[in-house]
């Protein structure tokens, strides 16, 4: 929830639409403080389900530069490396907030915004519909 | 990169750490407009490094509640349902953005913050350390 | 509109389970969290725990842990909740709740089932 | 879990009353506190989130104020139709906790 006391040190807001506009450092603190080896892995190469990465940009945005997750087989690579079409390779969806300039080209003002982004693949079983 | 003109019909900031603290407008908008099929399987559950959810909250942090993956085994689970060990099931990481109340406890104050969270797992061939 | 209709009326006997179901209608069922409340007399109301319909995540009250089991049906939009083992203790109208996740509050209500122990 | 003390039980008021309620938190909820009311054989509904926030469609004389640990609801000009139970919640963090509630009677 957002919104409303005087708390002592808190910055004051008059504005209209207070509490549904806030104020936003926009120095970002790294909460990741150790390189995640993990993160900086190689699994979009290594997966059975591998996948390529694009870069999405928008300017009206931010960050202005989010990396998209492609799989690249319609099925799961197998260890002698042939794709098995018996399986499906599918993009792991996440819902993550941006801010996105609002009024549009404006340097300060901005509006939360969810958008729907593909982080990398895996490999499901299908699901197999039965024809009676 | 976030800054400077002066767009008339533009909202004003006098704040002296402009252009690195701006207005952020809280009512979200949503970009996924229509029901994406994928985002809502139960690809969890299929997968060959099926994972579990679990809802992490901190009241200081907007969103509040962040649902993580956790993978449910360490290798990789095989047609006949029996998990394989030569394989691993590793977490698919993505850093997203957050706000964080600062000062805390003030309701519209924020800082972003980066964060780390797994969003799914996903079966990978293991590195194979050689010893001479 | 956002609806949820929850299910009838239920009189059980000591020790059965039963499934309470609520139906959603009116808005994407994957992209929001459903909570379950109980409300006794005696207690008010009580927060059992959440499904997220979605991702198939599950968490719950301490307390209810090892008396309810929450569960979803994406295709019929429906959010279940089974209780086990009854009890008198267990007499109580429930509701199910809908959780906006990002925003950080609940909205909707469905109308409540009134569970009813007895032998 | 955070306790949610919510007085007083009972209200019984004339139309056109000014009416308060008053919750207090067991522990800082900073501002995550919602008032439903709760009309007899119907779903409870929504009126205010983020302790101020008056929620979509909800008429200006239902009002919200607090911070931390001390909330009120209020009701500026009390209608017939305002019958109900009001109760108020904290979804600061889960267990998610309610207030006991407040019964509004008419004379």
């Known amino acids: 929830g957002i919104a409303i006391p005087r708390n002592s040190g808190c910055p004051n807001s008059e504005d209209k639409n207070f509490p549904r506009t806030v104020m936003v450092n926009l120095n970002i603190h790294n909460r990741n403080t150790s390189t995640n080896p993990k993160r900086s892995s190689d699994y979009y190469n290594r997966s059975t389900s591998p996948w390529n990465l694009h870069r999405n940009e928008d300017p009206e945005r931010y960050p202005s530069v989010i990396w998209e997750a492609k799989c690249r087989h319609l099925g799961c690579v197998k260890a002698d490396g042939n794709v098995d079409y018996h399986m499906n390779s599918v993009p792991i969806q996440q819902e993550i907030l941006v801010l996105r300039r609002e009024p549009r080209h404006c340097p300060n003002s901005f509006r939360l915004e969810k958008i729907l982004v593909s982080v990398g693949c895996t490999c499901v079983t299908p699901i197999v519909h039965h024809v009676a | 990169g976030i800054a400077i003109p002066r767009n008339s019909g533009c909202p004003n900031s006098e704040d002296k750490n402009f252009p690195r603290t701006v207005m952020v407008n809280l009512n979200i908008h949503n970009r996924n407009t229509s029901t994406n099929p994928k985002r809502s399987s139960d690809y969890y559950n299929r997968s060959t490094s099926p994972w579990n959810l679990h809802r992490n909250e901190d009241p200081e942090r907007y969103p509040s509640v962040i649902w993580e993956a956790k993978c449910r085994h360490l290798g990789c689970v095989k047609a006949d349902g029996n998990v394989d060990y030569h394989m691993n099931s590793v977490p698919i990481q993505q850093e997203i953005l957050v706000l964080r109340r600062e000062p805390r406890h003030c309701p519209n104050s924020f800082r972003l913050e980066k964060i780390l969270v797994s969003v799914g797992c996903t079966c990978v061939t293991p590195i194979v350390h050689h010893v001479a | 509109q956002v609806q949820l209709q929850q299910s009838g009326a239920e009189l059980v006997r000591p020790g059965a389970s039963v499934k309470l179901s609520c139906k959603a209608s009116?808005?994407?069922?994957?992209?929001?969290?459903m909570h379950w409340v109980k409300q006794t007399p005696v207690h008010g109301l009580e927060w059992i725990g959440v499904?997220?319909?979605?991702?198939?995540?599950?968490a719950y009250n301490q307390k209810f842990r090892d008396k309810a089991t929450l569960t979803a049906d994406k295709s019929s939009t429906t959010a279940y909740m089974e209780l086990s083992s009854l009890t008198s203790e267990d007499s109580a109208v429930y509701y199910c709740?809908?959780?906006?996740?990002?925003?950080?509050?609940?909205?909707?209500w469905g109308q409540g089932t009134t569970l009813t122990v007895s032998s | 879990s955070i306790v949610m003390t919510q007085t007083p039980k009972f209200l019984l008021v004339s139309a056109g009353d000014r009416v308060t309620i008053t919750c207090k938190a067991s522990q800082s909820v900073n501002n995550d506190v919602a008032w439903f009311q709760h009309k007899p054989g119907q779903s409870p509904k929504l009126l205010i989130n983020y302790a101020s926030n008056r929620y979509t469609g909800v008429p200006d004389r239902f009002t919200g104020s607090g911070y931390g640990t001390d909330f009120t609801f209020t009701i500026s000009t009390v209608q017939s139709e305002d019958l109900a139970i009001y109760f108020c919640q904290q979804d600061y963090g889960s267990p998610y906790t309610f207030g006991g509630g407040t019964t509004l009677e008419i004379k």
């Open positions: 009116g808005y994407t069922f994957s992209d929001y969290e």
């Open positions: 499904i997220h319909p979605g991702n198939g995540g599950t």
């Open positions: 709740i809908r959780f906006l996740t990002y925003e950080g509050y609940f909205d909707y």
